[in-house]
Structures are given as structure tokens and as C-alpha cells.
Interface confidence: low
């Protein structure tokens, strides 16, 4: 399933360099192992951002179809309960780009532990 | 087990073009960057460029843009360097490697030698 | 584009001795993202540490890695006759993913 998430993230990626989203997203960019979990729900819950800035048809159909199966994915984490992880608010804001990157590196570190 | 393997070594004349490739296995080729490094006779290590074979984004160190493309055939599992048009200071022994934990190269291939004299 | 700098150029130890090698950037490495390769004649690079001082996949525990923002160390605690190479430092977030001129570590 994180395999499709990187396929989805990178899907994103192309179809937003045609447009202009001057928006900036809450990113952790340097995800501890502890904390991986609650990253990456915020990188799911800006995500939508993307999503609703873009109005964009197959951009939401990508959006909806990565969160699907990275909740999917992250329920085989169980419940895993982190704790003295930064609240997404608490995160830099970066532009759509160093986002999706930070995002991607993420996911490989989801890959790398499964 | 993942494995980097690339083609073997060339000799070539200055002008000649060149692709050399690194067939990877063992794990999924569209999930992970595939860089490429230079070792010149007796230096250190240069790091040329990367790219991501899930959609072929492509950086390049900018020494090396412009100087060499960098591709890869999702098809077959293979990245590739090339060259347009050789110089004898392309001489060299050339790596392939993953981009593993945050893009360090985690697993190298065991190195492609180019000679490039007339 | 991040420049390393490695100290010293080379290293004359003996085996059992514990050496340090030093890697310095031109500006912070974000997220500490350092990784040491060592390499012997006529083979490949490998992956010892990155982040850092995170231990790569199958290294000994005699090789451990330190630092952040500009300053970065390599510390191998008892030399084996086998550790005896170059070592080269790369900052692994951005691109390009530049690396350090390298340092020998050569028997006494």
C-alpha cells in the first residue's frame, strides 16, 4: 500500500505543476521514528488543502484515493499512542513542492520499517 | 536480496557517445531515487545526480547539467547515464547506488569504468 | 550548495587505536541528514552512518557518528586491521547531495 501512497504523491506532484497554489502547508521535515505516526497525520490533513485549493477533479480523486490507503497502511500500526510529538500547528509551513517531499520521505521510512 | 548491478566497463574514443545502465532487483525500483557518483582515477567521490523512476524526476549537481542525461526504464528495472558526445576527462569509474534513509545511498552498484582516449 | 570539508586529510593509527575523523559544512545540514561511506581500494562505497549517527544496516558498533548543523564526527573505537580505507561524509537532504574530499586511514 505505500508503494501506491509514493505513486499517488507523485501523481500530485505532476498535476499541480501546471498550476499556480501559492498556499503553504504545515510540514515536518524532519520526522523522528517516534513520532512518525502523528506526522504523518498531518501530512494527511494538509493534504486536503492541496485538495480543496486546487479544484482541481483528478486531484481530488488522487487525494481521496492516497488518504484511503495510507489510513489503510497506518492501521497496521495499531493504536499506536506517541507521545512530546509537535502538534501539526506547531510545524514550519512550507510551499506545495517541499511538501510533497517531505511527504514522499515519510512514506519511504513507513517502506523501510514494514 | 537488492541488488545494483551495472554494465561493464568501456573504452571509447573522444566525440563517441556512450549509456551505461545499472539493473537493479530485489525491491521496488519506483520507490526509491537511483543516484549517480564519479570517482576519477585516484580522487574522491562526486555526486552527478538522482532520479526517481516512479516519474523520472530528475536533479542534477550542476557541474554535471547539461554533460550527461540521466534516465530510467520502469519496464526493465534499469537506470542509465549517458553521454552525447565523450571527453577525455569523462574518464573515470562510474557508481550507480539507491537513495535509501532520506536519499543516503544505501546500496552501490559494483561500478561502471570508462575510458575515454584516442 | 553545501561544501564539506574533511580534517585531517589522512590518518596514520595503529590497530586497536581509536580514530576521529571530522567532516565540516559551509552552512547547517537540515535535519542533521550526514551520512560517512567508507571505501578500500578497488571496490565500491558503503553506507556506514546516516542522519548523522544512525548505524547503517549490518556496520559494527565500533563505527559511531555525532554532530549537527555544521559539525559532524566519525569515531571508530578500536581499529581492525579490515578498517583501514578512505572514509567520505555526504549531506543527504538536498540536492545535490554533495560529499566531503575524503579521509585516509592509513597503518602507523
Known amino acids: 500500500n505505500w508503494v501506491n501512497v509514493i505513486s499517488d504523491l507523485k501523481k500530485i506532484e505532476d498535476l499541480i505543476q501546471s498550476m499556480h497554489i501559492d498556499a503553504t502547508l504545515y510540514t515536518e521535515s524532519d520526522v523522528h521514528p517516534s513520532c512518525k505516526v502523528t506526522a504523518m497525520k498531518c501530512f494527511l490533513l494538509e493534504l486536503q488543502v492541496i485538495s480543496l485549493e486546487s479544484g482541481d477533479a483528478s486531484i481530488h480523486d488522487t487525494v481521496e484515493n492516497l488518504i484511503i490507503l495510507a489510513n489503510n497502511s497506518l492501521s497496521s500500526n495499531g493504536n499506536v499512542t506517541e507521545s512530546g510529538c509537535k502538534e501539526c500547528e506547531e510545524l514550519e509551513e512550507k510551499n506545495i513542492k517541499e511538501f510533497l517531499q517531505s511527504f514522499v520521505h515519510i512514506v519511504q521510512m513507513f517502506i523501510n520499517t514494514s | 536480496e537488492v541488488q545494483l548491478v551495472q554494465s561493464g566497463a568501456e573504452v571509447k574514443k573522444p566525440g563517441e557517445s556512450l549509456k551505461i545502465s545499472c539493473k537493479v532487483s530485489?525491491?521496488?525500483?519506483?520507490?526509491?531515487?537511483i543516484g549517480w557518483v564519479r570517482q576519477m582515477p585516484g580522487k574522491g567521490l562526486e555526486y552527478m545526480g538522482i532520479i526517481y523512476p516512479g516519474d523520472s524526476d530528475t536533479r542534477y549537481s550542476p557541474s554535471f547539467q547539461g554533460q550527461v542525461t540521466i534516465s530510467a526504464d520502469k519496464s526493465i528495472s534499469t537506470a542509465y547515464l549517458q553521454w552525447s558526445s565523450l571527453k577525455a576527462s569523462d574518464t573515470a569509474m562510474y557508481y550507480c547506488?539507491?537513495?535509501?534513509?532520506?536519499?543516503?545511498?544505501?546500496?552501490w552498484g559494483q561500478g561502471t569504468l570508462v575510458t575515454v582516449s584516442s | 550548495e553545501i561544501v564539506l570539508t574533511q580534517s585531517p586529510g589522512t590518518l596514520s593509527l595503529s590497530p586497536g587505536e581509536r580514530a576521529t575523523l571530522s567532516c565540516r559544512a559551509s552552512?547547517?545540514?537540515?535535519?542533521?541528514?550526514l551520512a560517512w561511506y567508507q571505501q578500500k581500494p578497488g571496490q565500491a562505497p558503503r553506507l556506514l552512518i546516516y542522519s548523522a549517527s544512525k548505524l547503517a544496516s549490518g556496520i559494527p558498533d565500533r563505527f559511531s557518528g555525532s554532530g549537527s548543523g555544521t559539525d559532524f564526527t566519525l569515531t571508530i573505537s578500536r581499529l581492525e586491521p579490515e578498517d583501514f580505507a578512505v572514509y567520505y561524509c555526504q549531506q543527504h537532504y538536498s540536492t545535490p547531495g554533495t560529499f566531503g574530499q575524503g579521509t585516509k586511514v592509513e597503518i602507523k
Open positions: 547506488a539507491r537513495g535509501g534513509h532520506w536519499n543516503a545511498f544505501d546500496i
Open positions: 530485489g525491491y521496488f525500483f519506483t520507490t526509491y531515487w
Open positions: 552552512q547547517s545540514v537540515i535535519g542533521s541528514y
